[in-house]
Amino acid sequence: LVPHLGDREKRDSVCPQGKYIHPQNNSICCTKCHKGTYLYNDCPGPGQDTDCRECESGSFTASENHLRHCLSCSKCRKEMGQVEISSCTVDRDTVCGCRKNQYRHYWSENLFQCFNCSLCLNGTVHLSCQEKQNTVCTCHAGFFLRENECVSCSNCKKSLECTKLCLPQIENVKGTEDSGTT
């Protein structure tokens, strides 16, 4: 099965790369606008210039295009702990990220929140914190991992998964008690 092309792709595919088909006259191929600009008026005829205008402040286009309007610059989400890495220019959107010693947790494809990297207290760093992943910790004996923190086995309830991890510790405690009662 041949996938269906959208109207815009169909129109563009008739013209060579870097050009698009005139919306009112499909025998004319107009040159696309450079990044940082948008289409103000289509070219009046073959070999004639397309009227492209520079994006206004607060907007951008990141690739060659024939958009009637520039795209609005993204704003970094303070409520998600985001900070601005680089500001928006006419040809590049705002780049948002996290502070030092933080990582991004993606709640969805286009929404991330910044969280502090785990320090692995009562454990050791197995994998260092990365841009999009928290530190991976390995806990010391007598501790188990809960939400990426090393928690004392004394907080382990029977019904929880930690019983497997804390069982040797519990047995050791019992063994010590038993040996002292003879």
Epitope: R77, K78, E79, M80, H105, W107, Q113, F115, N116, N134, E147, N148
Partner: nanobody
């Protein structure tokens, strides 16, 4: 113990509207960013919309943009979600929660309210 109480769910026809509420008694509501998440049958949690503590910064998932509106009334400790032009794919249990601070799991959230969109 903090309890978030959602209400306003129900059965509605495609194209219809509902307004969900989330009451947060005994909660420092005005210092919390709040979020609506939903879980469709047999699916994972989806972040639907959130609102900053100031009430100004808002976010909507692409799937609900232009149809849903999030708002809050700090004097009533209540969060709202106005849902218009409902579709079958909006059928889910809707939960309100505070935006997590320490790590990517929800500290406080409610029991949920079921929204069913069906003709």
């Amino acid at each position: 113990e903090v309890q978030l109480l959602e209400s306003g769910g129900g059965m509605v026809q495609p194209g219809g509207s509902l307004r969900l509420s989330c009451a947060a008694p005994g909660f420092t509501f005005e210092h919390e960013g709040m979020v609506w998440v939903r879980q469709a049958p047999g699916k994972g949690l989806e972040w639907v919309s959130h609102i900053g503590e100031d009430g100004q910064s808002t976010y909507y998932a692409d799937s609900v943009k232009g149809r849903f509106t999030i708002s809050r009334d700090n004097s009533k400790n209540t969060l709202y979600l106005q849902m218009n032009s409902l579709r079958a794919e909006d059928t889910a249990v809707y939960y309100c929660a505070s935006i997590p601070k320490a790590g990517p799991s929800f500290d406080y959230w409610g029991q949920g309210t079921l929204v069913t969109v069906s003709s």
